[in-house]
Interface confidence: low
Amino acid sequence: DAHKSEVAHRFKDLGEENFKALVLIAFAQYLQQCPFEDHVKLVNEVTEFAKTCVADESAENCDKSLHTLFGDKLCTVATLRETYGEMADCCAKQEPERNECFLQHKDDNPNLPRLVRPEVDVMCTAFHDNEETFLKKYLYEIARRHPYFYAPELLFFAKRYKAAFTECCQAADKAACLLPKLDELRDEGKASSAKQRLKCASLQKFGERAFKAWAVARLSQRFPKAEFAEVSKLVTDLTKVHTECCHGDLLECADDRADLAKYICENQDSISSKLKECCEKPLLEKSHCIAEVENDEMPADLPSLAADFVESKDVCKNYAEAKDVFLGMFLYEYARRHPDYSVVLLLRLAKTYETTLEKCCAAADPHECYAKVFDEFKPLVEEPQNLIKQNCELFEQLGEYKFQNALLVRYTKKVPQVSTPTLVEVSRNLGKVGSKCCKHPEAKRMPCAEDYLSVVLNQLCVLHEKTPVSDRVTKCCTESLVNRRPCFSALEVDETYVPKEFNAETFTFHADICTLSEKERQIKKQTALVELVKHKPKATKEQLKAVMDDFAAFVEKCCKADDKETCFAEEGKKLVAASQAALGL
């Protein structure tokens, strides 16, 4: 439905508060280096303009597209060239090329200072002094560090952030109330950002068809009682929502997400029996709840898949008729029967089925050719099952920190060219699969583990894409979205790698390590471990373990010493010498 003024339409649909928040997120995700005050000024100008359009949709410029209005506004930033360099060239382009240009300059790893959490009393004072500015600042800081964060979901996080301060700043022990809530929001926020980044990568790098296939599989697992046509409608609408958000169209995205939640709740009888509680919540909570809702129970009377997809004489006729619809039906039917499989496994099975039909439907006897197609699925199913079993056993034996270290060594040997901070970040996240998924029963382990690994490996892919250094990473990241994890799993030690020269500075530590949190201390140690492997890729597990044990003892000893700095200097030299000897450096 066409509107005279798109900006007025979205302002009326979303309301002023959400409109302003979403425009701030959009601007902060595009111009990630701009100061907070500059963005607030731009947002206020856009909001005042939107209000004039609400009053009179025929007013000057009200008929312009949102991309034109927002792009024009961003291009008024005086320091664009000094701050952003070639991104300023985007402003010479016309829409839609200008918006595409801005999108291409989004930085997954912007050079921004780490967010340091102030004292609780300082935060509570700031919250009480100016609640609106305090919450805007939260949106701004998250959005600029996570340029693909799912905007309507960020509004939900901000609502929880506000609720935490409202409750805890009145509590007797403010810190005990607030800090766990902020930790939870931080961890959930990072996970949410990474999940959305995979959705955007899927759409942008592999296209709408790839995203739709993912969505068919996931929604069919979640809503196994829904008809195929119903699932297809949800997939189409969900694809539109995520295409918009990934494309920077945050107002449209939030509006369409609200419409989708409304539709789902109005039609929950034909979708899922698990939606009742979600649908009683306010909008932001409702949308979040629907996105996280547990799988409905499978219908009891589902017939064998073989009848329609193997035994039927019409398989090739049905396939030729509408290939994507027939494959969609296959994926739907398989996924609704297998909540115990990961989405990426289901997509591998569908791809195998498609490849078989392409080959067999051109053969002399198609039925004879594809009769055994389901037998080809067995090894595809067993591979992730075995991998998860082995890694969960290793995790249970080592615990999270040492399991992360095992993965650090494994991945540094596979792709030693990747930067140390990226290897540490990615391997730490890969290692979290243990505590996240290994506690689950068998039936839930694979969807938990493999789909989580897809999210983490996508982080590696987007970080590597910014500064490509490894052909092996590029190959695994670009060849097939669903085979990324098997591709990385299959990589052996990179025999072509020339070890890094030894640099004692890398292994020099100071007393400041003693005041770090346990997590930060672990990261320091894990950074040293990666550097060791880069120096000595052929080092055995035993050698590396011995050096890391010595290192841990050294840190503990010097942190207990009276003159910490002297201890780190003197004992550090001894440790470096001993490590060099142990590793034959």
Epitope: S232, N318, E321, A322, V325
Partner: nanobody, 116 residues
Framework: QVQLVESGGGLVQPGGSLRLSCAAS????????MSWVRQAPGKGFEWVSS????????RYADSVKGRFTISRDNARNTLYLQMNSLKPEDTAVYYC?????????SGQGTQVTVSS
């Protein structure tokens, strides 16, 4: 809700013509192959014709080949069946369905009666 509403049926003499329409809503019409199926009194469903999602590929049952034409308008979310040279054995309730041959109807159908 997924909805398929058939219309255009009626009473027609042998040799006459009718044009059936099927208005689709509640799903991504342009993404799906569509079919017409029919059910004669006291009989099971019989596939009549199918068209792929773009409209470039059409299929017909031998019994209607050369007389019926299936088409679609994706802008209007509508499926059509042009029926010429109608015969008494074409008498049936006609349904549109999502998918290719073998698709199951979900609408109410439209009655076509060919009789002199």
């Amino acid at each position: 809700q997924v909805q398929l509403v058939e219309s255009g049926g009626g009473l027609v003499q042998p040799g006459g013509s009718l044009r059936l329409s099927c208005a689709a809503s509640g799903f991504a019409f342009r993404g799906f192959g569509m079919s017409w199926v029919r059910q004669a009194p006291g009989k099971g469903f019989e596939w009549v014709s199918s068209i792929n999602n773009g409209g470039s590929d059409t299929r017909y049952a031998d019994s209607v080949k050369g007389r019926f034409t299936i088409s679609r308008d994706n802008a209007r979310n509508t499926l059509y069946l042009q029926m010429n040279s109608l015969k008494p054995e074409d008498t049936a309730v006609y349904y549109c369905a999502i998918g290719g041959p073998g698709a199951s109807p979900s609408g109410q159908g439209t009655q076509v009666t060919v009789s002199s």
